[in-house]
Structure formats: C-alpha cells, structure tokens
C-alpha cells in the first residue's frame, strides 16, 4: 500500500499485514444447516445460494457434513479460527480449499473443513487426491 494510506485499521472491521495490504472480511457460503444429497462422493458443491461477507476480517469459511440414520446435512458458515466449532479446532484454516476431515462424534458421521479463499466452502472435498478434478 502506498504511504498515504492510513495505518489506522479498526481490527473488528479490517486487518493489515506487514506488507501493507489490508484484509477485508472474507466472502463465504453461509446457509447454516441444510439437508444435503452429498453422499459417497469425492467432492460436492454446497448448493448454497447465499454468499455472505463475514463479520470479522480474520474469520474463515467453514463447512460441516453430517450423516446419521435420519438424514445428511451440510452446514456452511463463517467462523473465527481461534475458536473451536462444534467443539473442534479448525484445522487448515489458511487453506485455499475446503478438504474434509472426519471427526469422532457419537451417533453420526461427522466431517468438517475450513478454508480462506472467497466462497471456498462452496466446493467441499472428501478425497485430497481428487482436488484438481471437477465436482461429481
């Protein structure tokens, strides 16, 4: 950033790095919990039509896939990676891709991913080896 750009940055709204760039809040898919047809696939689209601007600049995109004996749901939200989500630490929060990791939960199959590129939780990946292919 040129020197004329003010160094004063409200950390609740924006953040800055050592190179002088300013971080605006991320754009993420944000449909909360929705029923999903994503099952036994290497990758899926979220089918969430809502793109939200996260409240804080450090928040990242998150997707949570859950399957139990009743249904399959996909949750898409923004979340602060410093805080746990559903009791789990957000791994790979700086990743450009949302690569699902299984978490141990009683009574259901539970996968979660986090990423930090705009709308990156729109395309969720269950098999890292297929990250270059298009969604099923």
């Amino acid at each position: 950033i040129p020197p004329h750009v003010p160094k004063s940055v409200n950390s609740d709204v924006m953040a800055s790095d050592n190179g002088g760039a300013v971080k605006l809040p991320q754009l993420c898919k944000f449909c909360d919990v929705r029923l999903s047809t994503c099952d036994n696939q290497k990758s899926c689209m979220s089918n969430c039509s809502i793109t939200a601007i996260c409240e804080k600049p450090h928040e990242v995109c998150v997707a949570v896939w859950r399957k139990n004996d009743k249904n399959i749901t996909l949750e898409t939200v923004c979340h602060d990676p410093k805080l746990t989500y559903h009791g789990f630490t957000l791994e790979d929060a700086a990743s450009p891709k949302c690569v699902m990791k299984e978490k141990k939960r009683a009574g259901e199959t539970f996968f979660m991913c986090a990423c930090n590129m705009e709308e990156c939780n729109d395309y969720i990946i269950f098999s890292e080896e297929y990250t270059t292919s298009s969604p099923d």
Epitope: G20, L24, M117
Partner: nanobody, 119 residues
Amino acid sequence: EVQLLESGGGLVQPGGSLRLSCAASGFTFSEYDMAWVRQAPGKGLEWVSRIRSDGVRTYYADSVKGRFTISRDNSKNTLYLQMNSLRAEDTAVYYCAKDRAKNGWFDYWGQGTLVTVSS
C-alpha cells in the same frame, strides 16, 4: 505499475448524491475483485462495498446498503460508486482498492477522494 485514481468527490448537502470513479491501469482489471473503503476524520478504515470481477455480484456494508451502488465497466477499466441519500456520517476519504488473490487481501490503493456531506 498498478495505478488507481479516484475522482468525483466534493461537498454535497445531506440527502444529495455523488458518483465516484476509479480509473485503473497496470493490471488486467477484469480479472480482479475491487472494493471501496473509506476513512472518516479521526476514525479507522471501514470497508464500504465490494464487487466481483464479473461485475455481477456486489456486497455492501450495512451502513450504506440501499443507498450506495457499486459497479464497474471492464471495457473502460473503471470502478464506480453511486452514492445517494448522503448523510453527514458518510463524510470521509474514499479509496478504491484491488484484491490480491481472491483471498480478501487488498494490496493496491488509490490516493483517495474526499467526500464532505454538510449543509
């Protein structure tokens, strides 16, 4: 060299309108998201609006939603901000900024244009 040059600021009465422009050069404008960010006197930076590279998807801070409209003309390498129903609290220096890599980091800024809303 990347350059962003804002224009269109000035003094306007409350309830009035202004249209800001930002002429871009030195990069492939149509490939990058752009944003308007402002700084009110004595305050920190506040993001105002953001537009995707395709010009279709737009986003606004709650404080300007319904009053401001962001747009772009990729054939003219120009970003716009139409500001209607201006309020005293909209008084600020307005900067246009270029996204670095679709990750929310904006790395190039213009010199800014001052908008003063006062009667």
